[in-house]
Amino acid sequence: VSPTFQVVNSFAPVQECSTQLDIVIVLDGSNSIYPWDSVTAFLNDLLERMDIGPKQTQVGIVQYGENVTHEFNLNKYSSTEEVLVAAKKIVQRGGRQTMTALGIDTARKEAFTEARGARRGVKKVMVIVTDGESHDNHRLKKVIQDCEDENIQRFSIAILGSYNRGNLSTEKFVEEIKSIASEPTEKHFFNVSDELALVTIVKTLGERIFALEA
């Protein structure tokens, strides 16, 4: 508005705060994750905080163990309600091996493709949930660098349950999962004592994910 109260065009329109994220959750589904419904409860609590839709946040889920399964693609569902129903139905695929590098790499190469619903120019976020050292950790450094090169923000969650059950040292495992997280690590890495405790980090994780939108 000019001094004479005439409408004039501003030089730049006011920027809307973006609510667009493409989020792929990479779940360890090996047998040692127990009980599995702690994972689906975690998913439920996290997803119900999201405004999911083709023009808002999109969510895809990948499960890995000995191999990798796309549970659903980024563009499969167009509402939070639909995603919640689908996530509740995800069954544990099992297996003894934890191929974390394979899981992350598959998410990067496949889940984040336009064919599976990824959108150009939209921030990419990966959430990795695992409970054990990877059996393919020799590949991890390169896989993480590839994610970094593609500007994929990574949140990693270490579940210490199987280590605590076996009275094993968690030090090496925690270091590995920290290495997966984006910098600064303290904002992108979480650890929980066991699977039942996953729900305790949902609020903070959600806040940190959506802080990326700003």
Epitope: Y34, R93, S162, G166
Partner: antibody
Framework: EVQLVQSGAEVKKPGESLRISCKGS????????IGWVRQMPGKGLEWMGI????????RYSPSFQGQVTISADKSISTAYLQWSSLKASDTAMYYC??????????????????WGQGTLVTVS | EIVLTQSPGTLSLSPGERATLSCRAS???????LAWYQQKPAQAPRLLIY???RRATGIPDRFSGSGSGTDFTLTISRLEPEDFAVYYC?????????FGQGTTVEIK
């Protein structure tokens, strides 16, 4: 649909050998442990042992170690329980069950979420 | 080895009544790793409850589990005719699985 289908009832004489089977379907059979449970006539349930069909890693209950052999053939999604020399006291119903949980390292945990229909073994 | 003792051995009740079954462990069950199974005559056991209080898929909400440490309870809030059966508790926190001797819930 997850299913465990066991072989039919057997009547044997003491000293004979026997192998009973449990075929899994409706899930990745090589990715879950399968346990065996005995129920003697009119009695409760006893865990015998457990096998991972993917690599045939096997654990036994101390009470059954050396008494039975548990094996698997992953190519046909089947687990087996066998005796080399049956005794009258082996007369029982035998169930296989899928473990939702794990038995890696020194630690085993989990519940049995799907069960076979049972195989009745009579030794007399 | 953890020994599980179930009580009572037999529970005589009428449909619509509440059933409370007890399972006591000889030592603490780690992480509340205790399950309950139902077995009807000539049938395989069926999983009801795991991790002490989580209902298995398809189990009606009249079944509930509680407890931790050494004392666990299975409660059937209102008995239906199909609930008359034998119930077993099972612990799985010690790299071995042990079952209780069972509680029979019979029609009064």
């Amino acid at each position: 649909e997850v299913q465990l289908v066991q072989s039919g009832a057997e009547v044997k004489k003491p000293g004979e050998s026997l192998r009973i089977s449990c075929k899994g379907s409706g899930y990745s059979v090589t990715s879950y442990w399968i346990g065996w449970v005995r129920q003697m006539p009119g009695k409760g349930l006893e865990w015998m042992g457990i096998i991972y069909p993917g690599d045939s890693d096997t654990r036994y209950s101390p009470s059954f170690q050396g008494q039975v052999t548990i094996s698997a053939d992953k190519s046909i999604s089947t687990a087996y329980l066998q005796w080399s020399s049956l005794k009258a006291s082996d007369t029982a119903m035998y169930y296989c069950a899928r473990l939702q949980g794990d038995c890696s390292g020194g630690t085993c945990y989990g519940h049995f979420d799907y069960w076979g229909q049972g195989t009745l073994v009579t030794v007399s | 080895e953890i020994v599980l003792t179930q009580s009572p051995g037999t529970l005589s009740l009428s449909p619509g009544e509440r059933a409370t079954l007890s399972c006591r462990a000889s030592q603490s069950v780690s992480s509340s790793y205790l399950a309950w199974y139902q077995q009807k005559p000539a049938q395989a056991p069926r999983l009801l409850i795991y991790v002490a209080s989580r209902r298995a898929t398809g189990i009606p909400d009249r079944f509930s589990g509680s407890g931790s440490g050494t004392d666990f309870t299975l409660t059937i809030s209102r008995l239906e005719p199909e609930d008359f059966a034998v119930y077993y508790c099972q612990q799985y926190g010690t790299s071995s699985w042990t079952f209780g001797q069972g509680t029979t819930v019979e029609i009064k």
